[in-house]
C-alpha cells in the first residue's frame, strides 16, 4: 500500500489522543532505556509503511501483535484516513485470523512495540516531511 | 561487532539475473536493523538499491524497482540480492550494509560484478 | 529526487591542515545527511548522521554541520589517514535515498 494520500494530520491526532496512551499501557514496567531503536523512518509516508508492518506482521519471537489495543485502533486510523487501505487488507486479515494464537507478551514484543513507539515519534516530528 | 560479506558470481551475461548473498556474523539479521544494498560502478559514485528490515518490511530504490528482489533466509543468516536484465552499466562493485533505514552504519568489504557476455 | 552536489571535486592540502567540504542539496532535507568515508579498494564508513552527530569510534577532528540545503564537513587537523573521498548521503526522502559524487582529498 501507498501511504503518500493519508491524511497525515489526522493520523497524527489519532496517535496523540489514544495510540500513543496504548503503547505506553503495553509498555508499563518497562524502562525506556532498555532497548535500543534500530530503524527509523525518512518521511511520513515511511513511516507509516514501517509502522504497518511492523504492527501487523508475526517476527521471531513475537507471533501477533495485531490483537493489541494499540494495533486495532492502528488499523482504525490508516482504514479511515488511508483512502483505499481497508481493502488492501482484506487478504492479509484472513490470513491472520488463521494463525492467530494465545496473547503473550514476550521480551521480544515489548522490544517490537518500543521500535513502534520510536517510529510513530518520528512520524510526529513536526519537520518530517509529508512525502 | 557485526561483519557483513557479500559472495555471488563476479561475471554475469547481459540480459541474464544477476545474485548476490550477503552473509551476516556476530548478528541476527531478524533481532533488529535493516539489511540493505548498495552498488558502485568503478570510479563513480554510490546508488542505493534497497533494504529488507528485520521485520520483512522491503524497500527498493524506485528506478531499479522493476529488477530487483531483495529477500532473506533467517535461518542462514543471510540476505540476497536479484537484479533481472542486467547490462553493462549494471557493472558495479555491490556492497551489503547494514541500516536503521535511514542511512548505513556497518558493510561488507564488496564484491565486483562485471557484466559482460 | 533530491540531487547532492559536492564541493570542491578535489581538495589538495597537507597533513596538520584544516579541510573544509560542502555538500549542497537541491531541495530542504532538513538534517537528515550523513557523510562517509572511503579509502581506496574499501567500504565506506560512516562519519555523521543526522548531519553533526558523530557515528561510534569516529574521532573528534571530524565534524558536521548545517541543515536545510548547505552541510558541511569539517576535519579540524588532517592526519595521513584521513586522505580518502568523501560521500555524502541524504535520507529526507524516501525511497529515493542518493549520494553526492564525492570530494577527493588529497595530499599536496
Known amino acids: 500500500y501507498d501511504f503518500t494520500n493519508c491524511d497525515f494530520e489526522k493520523i497524527k491526532a489519532a496517535y496523540l489522543s489514544t495510540i500513543s496512551k496504548d503503547l505506553i499501557t503495553y509498555m508499563s514496567g518497562t524502562k525506556s532505556t532498555e532497548f535500543n531503536n534500530t530503524v527509523s523512518c525518512s518521511n511520513r509516508p515511511h513511516c507509516l509503511t514501517e509502522i504497518q508492518s511492523l504492527t501487523f506482521n508475526p517476527t521471531a519471537g513475537c507471533a501477533s501483535l495485531a490483537k493489541e489495543m494499540f494495533a486495532m485502533k492502528t488499523k482504525a486510523a490508516l482504514a479511515i484516513w488511508c483512502p483505499g487501505y481497508s481493502e488492501t487488507q482484506i487478504n492479509a486479515t484472513q490470513a491472520m485470523k488463521k494463525r492467530r494464537k494465545r496473547k503473550v507478551t514476550t521480551n521480544k514484543c515489548l522490544e517490537q512495540v518500543s521500535q513502534l513507539q520510536g517510529l510513530w515519534r518520528r512520524f510526529n516530528r513536526p519537520l518530517l516531511k509529508q512525502q | 561487532q557485526v561483519q557483513l560479506q557479500e559472495s555471488g558470481p563476479g561475471l554475469v551475461k547481459p540480459s541474464e539475473t544477476l545474485s548476490l548473498t550477503c552473509t551476516v556474523s556476530g548478528y541476527s539479521i531478524s533481532s533488529g536493523y535493516g539489511w540493505s544494498w548498495i552498488r558502485q560502478p568503478p570510479g563513480k559514485g554510490l546508488e542505493w538499491i534497497g533494504y529488507i528490515s528485520y521485520y520483512g518490511s522491503i524497500s527498493y530504490n524506485p528506478s531499479l524497482k522493476s529488477r530487483v528482489t531483495i529477500s532473506r533466509d533467517t535461518s542462514k543468516n543471510q540476505f540476497s540480492l536479484k537484479l533481472s536484465s542486467v547490462t553493462a552499466a549494471d557493472t558495479a562493485v555491490y556492497y551489503c550494509a547494514r541500516t536503521n533505514l535511514l542511512y548505513f552504519d556497518s558493510w561488507g568489504q564488496g564484491t565486483l560484478v562485471t557484466v559482460s557476455s | 529526487e533530491i540531487v547532492l552536489t559536492q564541493s570542491p571535486a578535489t581538495l589538495s592540502l597537507s597533513p596538520g591542515e584544516r579541510a573544509t567540504l560542502s555538500c549542497r542539496a537541491s531541495?530542504?532535507?532538513?538534517?537528515?545527511l550523513a557523510w562517509y568515508q572511503q579509502k581506496p579498494g574499501q567500504a565506506p564508513r560512516l562519519l555523521i548522521y543526522d548531519a553533526s552527530s558523530r557515528a561510534t569510534g569516529i574521532p573528534a577532528r571530524f565534524s558536521g554541520s548545517g541543515s536545510g540545503t548547505d552541510f558541511t564537513l569539517t576535519i579540524s587537523s588532517l592526519e595521513p589517514e584521513d586522505f580518502a573521498v568523501y560521500y555524502c548521503q541524504q535520507y529526507s526522502d524516501w525511497p529515493q535515498y542518493t549520494f553526492g559524487q564525492g570530494t577527493k582529498v588529497e595530499i599536496k
Open positions: 531541495q530542504s532535507v532538513s538534517n537528515n
